[in-house]
């Protein structure tokens, strides 16, 4: 969470941004809020990126002004006019690229004053893992798969019964490059599992942490998975 104050004469407005992460190939959001102003035609929103000449996006006088937009963002950005009314200047970024990572500035001017705040935008790939019982293996084993990760994550297994146990000796993890040659498929197999136990497969890089849980009993298999972005405001 970053709060910036702008000073314009005696007037300043608070602008707040949240560090966020973008998933390569998907749409992302760079979050920015400001003090709403009733005089709507005076609201100017500018998004800038460190090291890039030109603007990422500009919204003024009630509409987008893309005359100074840098070509790398052409056709990929949008702010939402109805949200501007309530002080939300967040930027939608379509088809997130690895090169979109960096420091962005959300600059706001209203009839009350001006302000800005920076945000750090990280890009990578992250996806939810799925754990299945691997019946092909010679012994009872679990297979944890996640289709898209970047940078290469670490994978760890844990179990409810054997808390604190190190499963690296009885697991095998592989990373397979996907067709676009950036992201990778993560596959990890855990051998010698016992029934009536809950196992967790944890995949983590510097952007996200994902966990898949599986509980295997005589009568059923229960699964649960979750994904959490790291260092997000």
């Amino acid at each position: 969470l970053i709060i910036g104050f702008g000073i314009s004469g005696k007037h300043f407005i608070t602008v707040t941004t949240f560090t966020s992460a973008g998933n390569i190939g998907e749409d992302g959001t760079l979050s920015c809020t400001f003090e709403p102003d009733i005089k709507l035609n005076g609201i100017v929103i500018q998004w800038l990126k460190e090291g890039i000449k030109g603007l990422v996006h500009e919204f003024k006088e009630g509409k987008d002004d893309l005359s100074q937009q840098h070509e790398m963002f052409r056709g990929r950005t949008a702010v939402f006019a109805d949200q501007v009314v309530v002080g939300n200047a967040s930027l939608r970024l379509k088809n997130v690229q690895l090169t979109d990572a960096g420091t962005y500035t959300c600059y706001i001017r209203t009839s009350k004053g001006k302000g800005n705040a920076n945000l750090e935008y990280k890009t990578g790939a992250f996806s939810m893992p799925e754990i299945n019982v691997d019946y092909n293996a010679s012994s009872e084993s679990l297979r944890c798969e996640a289709p898209r990760w970047f940078p290469q994550p670490t994978v760890a297994w844990a179990s409810q019964v054997d808390q604190g146990a190190n499963f690296s000796e009885v697991s095998n993890t592989s990373f397979e490059l996907n067709s676009e040659n950036v992201t990778m498929k993560v596959v990890s197999v855990l051998y010698n599992v016992t029934i009536n136990n809950t196992y967790s497969c944890m995949i983590e890089n510097d952007i996200a942490k994902a966990t898949g849980d599986i509980k295997v009993t005589d009568s059923e298999v229960k699964r649960r998975s979750q994904l959490q972005l790291l260092n997000s405001g």
Epitope: T33, E35, P36, D37, I38, K39, L40, N41, G42, E61, G62, K63, A81, D82, V84, V85, V86, G87
Partner: antibody, heavy 116, light 107 residues
Framework: QVQVVQSGAEVKKPGSSVKVSCKAS????????ISWVRQAPGQGLEWMGG????????NYAQKFQGRVTIIADKSTRTAYMELSSLRSEDTAVYYC?????????WGQGILVTVSS | EIVMTQSPATLSVSPGERATLSCRAS??????LAWYQQKPGQAPRLLIY???TRATGIPARFSGSGSGTEFTLTISSLQSEDFAVYYC?????????FGPGTKVDIK
């Protein structure tokens, strides 16, 4: 001095529609949103929807979606709110106001009575 | 939608006394909150926006405070013309929503 002037009282039959107007002075239409807020007898305030001429967008409260239409005529600086399929519960004073996000100038209100 | 609640429903105060009105939001609205005063037969009048900024022409005896989910409107010394109904309104998210109101009457 900003002025928001609304049309006169209306009596309508259930099932019919009502269209009320609101004329705003000054730069209201080029700079601000126009919202409609209603107040049933003895009740509180209820935001119905609004139009932002400069943004070219309208936004309606879910409760009125499909029944309410708000339009603005920039040339005459007049906003209109039409409410269809009227029922007795729609009997209220309908206010036109300048804003959102908040409302700094209000019209005098129009009493719309829905009765058979 | 964000639900606004106000307390008390009625506040009985003597002229010259201090009145404290509360408003609560069902989720955080930051400082995106306004207060209005309404007298019988009249349109509402904007008192406060941004949780604490007085609107043009509003006397200094009216003050607003709070952020997030808890807000307060304080009238430091009630004048006869202050007896009215007071509404809070959030503008953090569409749809804009009002509280049910607090009626301030003469004790």
């Amino acid at each position: 001095q900003v002025q928001v002037v609304q049309s006169g009282a209306e009596v309508k039959k259930p099932g019919s529609s009502v269209k009320v107007s609101c004329k705003a002075s000054g730069d209201t239409f080029s700079n601000y949103a126009i919202s409609w807020v209603r107040q049933a007898p003895g009740q509180g305030l209820e935001w119905m929807g609004g139009i932002i001429p400069i943004f070219g967008i309208t936004n309606y409260a879910q409760k009125f979606q499909g029944r309410v239409t708000i339009i603005a005529d920039k040339s005459t600086r007049t906003a209109y709110m039409e409410l269809s399929s009227l029922r007795s519960e729609d009997t209220a004073v309908y206010y036109c106001s300048r804003g959102g996000p908040y409302f700094d100038y209000w019209g005098q209100g129009i009493l719309v009575t829905v009765s058979s | 939608e964000i639900v606004m609640t106000q307390s008390p429903a009625t506040l009985s105060v003597s002229p010259g006394e201090r009145a404290t009105l509360s408003c609560r939001a069902s989720q955080s609205v930051s400082s995106n909150l306004a207060w209005y005063q309404q007298k019988p037969g009249q349109a509402p009048r904007l008192l406060i926006y941004g949780a604490s900024t007085r609107a043009t022409g509003i006397p200094a005896r009216f003050s607003g405070s709070g952020s997030g989910t808890e807000f307060t409107l304080t009238i430091s010394s009630l004048q006869s013309e202050d007896f009215a109904v007071y509404y809070c309104q959030q503008y953090k998210k569409w749809p804009f929503t009002f509280g049910p109101g607090t009626k301030v009457d003469i004790k």
